[in-house]
C-alpha cells in the first residue's frame, strides 16, 4: 500500500515521508523560522528618530536572512535533482509494472512536491521582500545616524565657543574685581587718614577749651571788666561747643549731643530721638563691625531697617555669595544690606518683614510677615517666614517652607538648573519659585514677558518686572 506522511523533526525542518512499495523516502525541507511570517505586522519604512537601532544588530539579522536564502536555494536544487532522478526510476518501474494505481500515487507525490516547491518559492519571495525592506530601513537609519552625528558635532562646536566666550568674560570680570579691590584699599587708606586728621583736630579743640576754661577761672577773680570778658569768653566757648556737636552730627547722624551711641537697628535709632529718614550706622551688640543702613522713620510708625531696595537699575544685583553676605550698593539708593548682619540681627529677637512693591502703572502693594529670620551661613541663610498679610497676594510669593539662599556662584536651589544664573540675582530660590526681587531691572515698556525680571508672582504674575521694591524689618513689639 501507499502512505504519505508529514511531520516535524527536532531542529524545526518539515519532514516529508513517502512510502512506496518496499521503499520509503524522507525529504527534509528547511523552514524560515528566523524570519517574520508574512502575516506579522511589520512596517518597512518605520524609522526611529532619536535613537536608531544598533547597527551591528541589524547587520547580524541581515546575515541570518542571507544564510536562510542560501540554504533554501541549495535545498531547492537538491530537491529538483532528486525529483528528476526519482522520476526516471519511477517511470521505468511504472512502464515495467504498468500498474494504474501506482501511477496515480506518483502523480499525487509529484503534485505535492510541486505544491511544496511553489510554497517554498513564495516564501522565498517574501524573504527577499523583507530583506529589501530591512536594507532600505538600515540605509535610512545610517543616514539618520550621520545627520544626528553632524548635529551633535555642531552643538559641541557651539558649546565650545560659548565656553571660550564665558572664560574670556570670566577673566575680564576677575581683572575688574581685582581693580576694584585695589581701589577699595586706597579709599580705606584715605578714610583712615581723614579720621586721624579729625582726631587731631578734636584734641586741639579740647585743649583750646581747657585753656579757655582756665582763663575763665582766672577772670572771675578780677573786676567788672574782667567779668565782662568772662561773659564774652563763655559765649565763645558755647559757640565752639555748638560748632563741635553740629560738625559731628553732620558727619554721622548716630552721634547725638556730642557722644557716640551704637544702635543695632533703625528701631533703636528711632527710639533715641532720631526720627528723620536717612542713612545711619548700625552695630550689632558685642560687635565692632558697622554697617550703613537706610532707616525709614515715617512709614507705618517708622523704625524700619531697609534690607533691600530696587528703584532704577543703577546697581547690578548679579553678585557673588560673598557680596550678598556682606552687602553691596548704595544705602540711599539701590542696595542689599547683607545676609550676615540680617541673620545675626533676626536671631537676637523677633522681627517682622515688610515687602513694599511698585508697578509701572502707579500701583503699590505690600506683603507683611509677622515673623522673619534668616538661618546662619552654615545653613545657607535659609529664610523663615510666618503669618502673611497684605495686599500683594494672599499666597506667599516666597516659597514655603523657606529655601536656602542661592547666588550665581552658590547653587542651593531645588532645581536641576541653576536658578540664580538663569533668572539672575541672589534669592531664596525654590525650583525656581514665584518670586525674585533681585532679578534684572527692566525699564518701562520692556517690563512684560520677562522671565528674569523683578518678580512677585502672586501680585503681578510671572512675566511682569516691577518698577520698585523695598524689603524692611522691624522688631515685632515696636
Amino acid at each position: 500500500y501507499n502512505n504519505f506522511r508529514k511531520s516535524m523533526d527536532s531542529i524545526g525542518k518539515k519532514q516529508y515521508q513517502v512510502q512506496h512499495g518496499s521503499c520509503s523516502y524522507t525529504f527534509l525541507l528547511p523552514e524560515m523560522d528566523n524570519c517574520r511570517s508574512s502575516s506579522s505586522p511589520y512596517v518597512s519604512n518605520a524609522v526611529q528618530r532619536d535613537a536608531p537601532l544598533e547597527y551591528d544588530d541589524s547587520v547580524q539579522r541581515l546575515q541570518v536572512l542571507e544564510n536562510i536564502m542560501e540554504n533554501n536555494t541549495q535545498w531547492l536544487m537538491k530537491l529538483e535533482n532528486y525529483i528528476q532522478d526519482n522520476m526516471k526510476k519511477e517511470m521505468v518501474e511504472i512502464q515495467q509494472n504498468a500498474v494504474q494505481n501506482q501511477t496515480a500515487v506518483m502523480i499525487e507525490i509529484g503534485t505535492n512536491l510541486l505544491n511544496q516547491t511553489a510554497e517554498q518559492t513564495r516564501k522565498l519571495t517574501d524573504v527577499e521582500a523583507q530583506v529589501l525592506n530591512q536594507t532600505t530601513r538600515l540605509e535610512l537609519q545610517l543616514l539618520e545616524h550621520s545627520l544626528s552625528t553632524n548635529k551633535l558635532e555642531k552643538q559641541i562646536l557651539d558649546q565650545t565657543s560659548e565656553i571660550n566666550k564665558l572664560q574670556d568674560k570670566n577673566s575680564f570680570l576677575e581683572k575688574k574685581v581685582l581693580a576694584m579691590e585695589d581701589k577699595h584699599i586706597i579709599q580705606l587708606q584715605s578714610i583712615k587718614e581723614e579720621k586721624d586728621q579729625l582726631q587731631v583736630l578734636v584734641s586741639k579743640q579740647n585743649s583750646i577749651i581747657e585753656e579757655l576754661e582756665k582763663k575763665i577761672v582766672t577772670a572771675t577773680v578780677n573786676n567788672s571788666v574782667l567779668q565782662k570778658q568772662q561773659h564774652d569768653l563763655m559765649e565763645t566757648v558755647n559757640n565752639l561747643l555748638t560748632m563741635m556737636s553740629t560738625s559731628n552730627s553732620a558727619k554721622d547722624p548716630t552721634v547725638a549731643k556730642g557722644e557716640q551711641i551704637s544702635f543695632r537697628d533703625c528701631a533703636e535709632v528711632f527710639k533715641s530721638g532720631h526720627t528723620t529718614n536717612g542713612v545711619y550706622t548700625l552695630t550689632l551688640p558685642n560687635s565692632t563691625e558697622e554697617v550703613k543702613a537706610y532707616c525709614d522713620m515715617e512709614a507705618g510708625g517708622g523704625g524700619w531697617t531697609i534690607i533691600q531696595r530696587r528703584e532704577d537699575g543703577s546697581v547690578d544685583f548679579q553678585r557673588t555669595w560673598k557680596e550678598y553676605k556682606v552687602g553691596f550698593g548704595n544705602p540711599s539708593g539701590e542696595y542689599w544690606l547683607g545676609n550676615e548682619f540680617v541673620s545675626q540681627l533676626t536671631n537676637q529677637q523677633r522681627y517682622v518683614l515688610k515687602i513694599h512693591l511698585k508697578d509701572w502703572e502707579g500701583n503699590e502693594a505690600y506683603s507683611l510677615y509677622e515673623h522673619f529670620y534668616l538661618s546662619s551661613e552654615e545653613l545657607n541663610y535659609r529664610i523663615h517666614l510666618k503669618g502673611l498679610t497684605g495686599t500683594a497676594g494672599k499666597i506667599s510669593s516666597i516659597s514655603q517652607p523657606g529655601n536656602d539662599f542661592s547666588t550665581k556662584d552658590a547653587d542651593n536651589d531645588k532645581c536641576i538648573c541653576k536658578c540664580s544664573q538663569m533668572l539672575t540675582g541672589g534669592w531664596w530660590f525654590d525650583a525656581c519659585g514665584p518670586s525674585n526681587l533681585n532679578g534684572m531691572y527692566y525699564p518701562q515698556r520692556q517690563n512684560t514677558n520677562k522671565f528674569n525680571g523683578i518678580k512677585w508672582y502672586y501680585w503681578k504674575g510671572s512675566g511682569y518686572s516691577l518698577k520698585g521694591t523695598t524689603m524692611m524689618i522691624r522688631p515685632a513689639g515696636f
Epitope: 534684572m440 527692566y442 525699564p443 518701562q444 515698556r445 520692556q446 514677558n449
Partner: antibody, heavy 120, light 106 residues
C-alpha cells in the same frame, strides 16, 4: 509731515555745558516717548537718554548719568538735553528720535542731528 | 549690557545681487531687534522691527529673520540706493546698537 529739528550744538571746552533742543512738528509730542541718540565721528550709534510722554519717567545711559538731563515741554512741542561736565568722548552728532508708539526704544523718526564738539 | 555684534564689517556686492547681513546678540533678546539704514550725512532710517516686520514704506526686497541671539537682514536684489551702512539694535533690555555693516559697490 513728521519733522524734528535739533539745535544748540557747537564747540565747547571740557567741563563746559550745552543745552540741546529739538523742535517737533507734524505730530503731537505729548503722545510719544522721545529719545536722544548720538554718533561719534566715524563711529556707530549710541542711545543716550529717553523720556516718557508726560516726563514722569526718564532714563540715561550710565556714561552720562549725573551729567546729562533729558526734559521736555509738551506745550512748546520741544525736547531738551542739558549737558554739563562735558568730556572729549561726548563729541558726537546728537539726534533726537521719536519712539514708535507703545514700543520701547524703537525709533521710527529721526532729526538731522546737531554736532557737539568738546575740545580745548 | 547686551552687546550686539555685526558681521561682516564691510560687504562688497554688485547691483542686482543678494546681500546677507548678520547680527548676533550676547544674550537672548527674543525678537526684539530692529534694523536701520544710514547714508552719509543723513539720519538713520528704520527698516525692520520685531526681527522680521517691515516698517512703513520699506520695499519688499528688505527682509529680516531670526530670534534669540542670531539675526539676518537680507536684501534680495541690491539697488543703487541701497548702498549704505546698516545697524542692528536690540530693545529687549535697555537699548544698544551693533557697530554697523557697510554695504559697498563691488
Amino acid at each position: 509731515e513728521v519733522q524734528m529739528v535739533e539745535s544748540g550744538g557747537g564747540l565747547v571746552q571740557p567741563g563746559g555745558s550745552l543745552r540741546l533742543s529739538c523742535a517737533a512738528s507734524g505730530f503731537t509730542l505729548r503722545s510719544y516717548w522721545m529719545s536722544w541718540v548720538r554718533q561719534a565721528p566715524g563711529k556707530g550709534l549710541e542711545w543716550v537718554a529717553n523720556i516718557k510722554e508726560d516726563g514722569s519717567e526718564k532714563y540715561h545711559v550710565d556714561s552720562v548719568k549725573g551729567r546729562f538731563t533729558i526734559s521736555r515741554d509738551n506745550a512748546e512741542n520741544s525736547l531738551f538735553l542739558q549737558m554739563s561736565s562735558l568730556r572729549a568722548e561726548d563729541t558726537a552728532v546728537y539726534y533726537c528720535a521719536r519712539d514708535m508708539e507703545a514700543s520701547a526704544g524703537l525709533f521710527d523718526y529721526w532729526g538731522q542731528g546737531t554736532l557737539v564738539t568738546v575740545s580745548s | 549690557e547686551i552687546v550686539m555684534t555685526q558681521s561682516p564689517a564691510t560687504l562688497s556686492v554688485s547691483p542686482g545681487e543678494r546681500a546677507i547681513l548678520s547680527c548676533r546678540a550676547s544674550q537672548s533678546i527674543s525678537s526684539n531687534l530692529a534694523w536701520y539704514q544710514q547714508k552719509p550725512g543723513q539720519a538713520p532710517r528704520l527698516l525692520i522691527y520685531g526681527a522680521s516686520t517691515r516698517a512703513t514704506g520699506i520695499p519688499a526686497r528688505f527682509s529680516g529673520s531670526g530670534s534669540g541671539t542670531e539675526f539676518t537682514l537680507t536684501i534680495s536684489s541690491l539697488q543703487s540706493e541701497d548702498f549704505a551702512v546698516y545697524y542692528c539694535q536690540q530693545y529687549n533690555y535697555w537699548w544698544t546698537f551693533g557697530q554697523g555693516t557697510k554695504v559697498e559697490i563691488k
